[in-house]
Interface confidence: medium
């Protein structure tokens, strides 16, 4: 029986050229998380495997950074990044939990390039 719930950042917005953190948290279950997939519609952005660590899809490696936690950071946003993002938790023995985030990237009237930052 799947008892867990996923909390996400929900509907969020950011400006073109900026950065965003996508964050999910699985609670209310004792199931072991074996892997978390981050997907944009039907595209795989990144995988965090409990044993193997992070893998960023090659087509996103210049704009995607792992963390904080099991979250994902998107940088140098474009209007084309607008859309649904999914965190997919693979757990044992429960199975799969999915969280949804909707990101809207807005045209920036202030600055063309958003600030970047480091995740220590």
């Amino acid at each position: 029986m799947m008892t867990g719930t996923i909390e996400t950042t929900g509907n969020i917005s950011a400006e073109k050229g900026g950065s965003i953190i996508l964050q999910c948290h699985l609670s209310s279950t004792t199931a072991q998380v074996t892997q978390v997939n981050w997907e944009q519609q039907d595209q795989l952005l990144a995988i965090c495997n409990a044993d193997l660590g992070w893998h960023i899809s090659p087509s996103f490696k210049d704009r995607v950074a792992p963390g904080p936690g099991l979250g994902l950071t998107l940088q140098s946003l474009t209007v084309n990044d607008t859309g649904e993002y999914f965190c997919i938790y693979h757990t044992y023995p429960d199975g799969t939990y999915t969280g949804r985030i909707f990101l809207e990237v807005l045209e920036s009237s202030v600055a063309e390039h958003g600030a970047r930052f480091q995740i220590p």
Epitope: Q23, S108, A115
Partner: nanobody, 115 residues
Framework: EVQLVESGGGLVQPGGSLRLSCAAS????????MGWFRQAPGKEREWVAS???????WYADSVKGRFTISADNSKNTAYLQMNSLKPEDTAVYYC?????????WGQGTLVTVSS
């Protein structure tokens, strides 16, 4: 546009404490995420801590066990309680709401840890 106003910084001795506040206003989604970042002189801005509306928190390794992030969603305000401060914590601290942060940033609040 979201306006963010950080406050609570100041000069403190090593080992001391400070509590930073960040008040958010303006049009925003109700994502419920808030985070703190900092920028030390001559360094890149770095992520410090994050909190989700359910109270889940994440911290950079450098502050884990010393800093505590919290948020009062009814007041659209985030807090950063900083204990056992070290000279290397000296920086301008900024907050971000809903996971998005833009240029220009808010003015931030300066924290100086020095004896």
């Amino acid at each position: 546009e979201v306006q963010l106003v950080e406050s609570g910084g100041g000069l403190v001795q090593p080992g001391g404490s400070l509590r930073l506040s960040c008040a958010a206003s303006g049009n925003t989604f109700s994502g419920g995420f808030m985070g703190w970042f900092r920028q030390a002189p001559g360094k890149e801005r770095e992520w410090v801590a994050s909190v989700l509306r359910g109270g889940y928190t994440w911290y950079a390794d450098s502050v884990k066990g010393r800093f505590t992030i919290s948020a009062d969603n009814s007041k659209n305000t985030a807090y950063l309680q900083m204990n056992s401060l070290k000279p290397e914590d000296t920086a301008v601290y900024y907050c971000a709401k809903d996971g998005g942060w833009f240029d220009p940033w808010g003015q931030g609040t300066l924290v100086t840890v020095s004896s």
